[in-house]
């Protein structure tokens, strides 16, 4: 028996359902009584779901997995994972045994989009050209970690005096805070771009300083 899975990682958004595809080619006369199917976490060997002795043995993994029972006889051994969490991310191995056995691993990549960044300025009044200001760009509830890029009004990257930190919440999602310290010119726009590297999603925030008032 030959097991086939997708070479590319399966990308799933947090709180959505994902299908980890796995298939085999059944011989003529194949019956489910002959099938042993096991899904497990590749690294830890933890059992996720199994089908043995002619029946679905159910989920061994937080009761959020299911097979496609009507499609098994056609060689579809795919696994459905419901309400995906950050902690589900990783490699899953599909083992199929009929007379001989084969296995293959499929990677699940979890993602969550970042919010539109909020911008804060310190100090935020009585600003003069030549003043040192701290601009903070904050974006929330994304996954995985974000890349943060700063640019000035002409699109020139600002790389000096940037400090970016990540905070992980209890669900494993990240809040990203990036701080730019810059000496003010006569006026100017400072923009931050928060990029989710998996989704290739860019979230933009900017602040324009033109004396008073400030524009966000």
């Amino acid at each position: 028996v030959e097991v086939q899975v997708s070479e590319d990682p399966v990308v799933a958004l947090v709180d959505t359902d994902a299908t980890l595809r796995c298939s085999f080619s059944p011989e003529p006369g194949f019956s489910l009584a002959q099938l042993n199917l096991i899904w497990q976490l590749t690294d830890t060997k933890q059992l996720v779901h199994s089908f043995t002795e002619g029946r679905d043995q159910g989920s061994a993994y937080s009761n959020r997995t299911a097979l496609f029972p009507d499609l098994l006889v056609q060689g579809n051994a795919s696994l459905r994972l419901q309400r995906v969490r950050v902690t589900d991310e990783g490699s899953y191995t599909c083992f199929v045994s009929i007379q001989d056995f084969d296995s293959a691993a499929v990677s699940l990549q979890v993602a969550a989009p970042y919010s539109k960044p909020s911008m804060t300025l310190e100090p935020n009044k009585d600003l003069r050209p030549g003043n040192m200001v701290t601009i903070t760009c904050s974006s929330y509830q994304g996954y995985p970690e974000a890349e943060v890029f700063w640019k000035d009004g002409q699109g020139v990257p600002l790389t000096g005096n940037v400090t970016t930190s990540q905070m992980a919440n209890e669900r494993g999602l990240f809040d990203v805070h990036s701080v730019l310290r810059v000496v003010l010119g006569a006026n100017g726009t400072y923009s931050c771009l928060v990029r989710n590297p998996v989704l290739q999603q860019d979230a933009h925030g900017s602040v324009t300083i033109t004396g008073q008032p400030l524009t966000f």
């Epitope: 690294d43 991310e89 992980a168 990240f174």
Partner: antibody, heavy 121, light 108 residues
Framework: DVQLVESGGGVVRPGESLRLSCAAS????????MNWVRQAPGEGLEWVSR?????????YYADSVKGRFTISRDNSKNTLYLQMNSLRAEDTAVYYC?????????????WGLGTLVTVSS | EIVLTQSPGTLSLSPGERATLSCRAS??????LAWYQQKPGQAPRLLIY???TRATDIPDRFSGSGSGTEFTLTISSLQSEDFAVYYC??????????FGGGTKVEIK
């Protein structure tokens, strides 16, 4: 079994460079963030640098090494690196390679045995 | 930067006694705190993560508790192999991923 094996330590003079390597096995290397943690003789643990998983190469550094050290990884070789430039006497330490428990939970569930870096004139 | 303060610096106890180690964070870390054991000449070993979850193959005499800013590692009955240095580490916010200064548990 998870194994992390560091190499590349040695004795160098201040201002010189050194490149540390960490060979990983027993887990899907590309799926995990990796770190370097150091321990000066008789002192506590100090986190040095972290690189996130896959090929995204999002990196972080302790202030004490920022601009001098560069972390990188080669997922095809299951290897983590630390390029250390402009070394100082205060960089003398045992350097440990450590695997993050997951990408969002950065405790260190497996450690290498360490490699000693001595910076001395 | 989150600063972790461990106390006491040294704990002198006899085998069979209960050890209570403290780790205080300068700001809340939720439950994102880990404990490590390090013996002389060895790499650190993960004991506890998530403030209270024992790592793989860690005996149940080790337990962690606390959340927010106050955390405790308890060794219910010290064995000879438990005399070592113990470190706490936060992983809610980085860089840096900070460690406490350590508590040495020595034989009385």
């Amino acid at each position: 079994d998870v194994q992390l094996v560091e190499s590349g330590g040695g004795v160098v003079r201040p201002g010189e460079s050194l490149r540390l390597s960490c060979a990983a096995s027993g887990f899907t290397f590309s799926n995990y963030a990796m770190n370097w943690v150091r321990q000066a003789p008789g002192e506590g643990l100090e986190w040095v640098s972290r690189i996130n998983y896959k090929g995204y190469n999002i990196t972080y550094y302790a202030d004490s090494v920022k601009g001098r050290f560069t972390i990188s990884r080669d997922n095809s070789k299951n290897t983590l690196y630390l390029q250390m430039n402009s070394l100082r006497a205060e960089d003398t330490a045992v350097y440990y390679c450590a695997k993050s428990g997951s990408n969002s939970n950065n405790f260190f569930d497996y450690w290498g045995l360490g490699t000693l870096v001595t910076v001395s004139s | 930067e989150i600063v972790l303060t461990q106390s006491p610096g040294t704990l002198s106890l006899s085998p069979g006694e209960r050890a209570t180690l403290s780790c205080r964070a300068s700001q809340t870390v939720g439950s994102k705190l880990a404990w490590y054991q390090q013996k002389p000449g060895q790499a650190p070993r993960l004991l506890i993560y998530g403030a209270s979850t024992r790592a793989t193959d860690i005996p149940d005499r080790f337990s962690g508790s606390g959340s927010g800013t106050e955390f405790t590692l308890t060794i219910s009955s010290l064995q000879s192999e438990d005399f070592a240095v113990y470190y706490c580490q936060q992983y809610i916010n980085w860089p840096p991923l900070s460690f406490g200064g350590g508590t040495k548990v020595e034989i009385k």
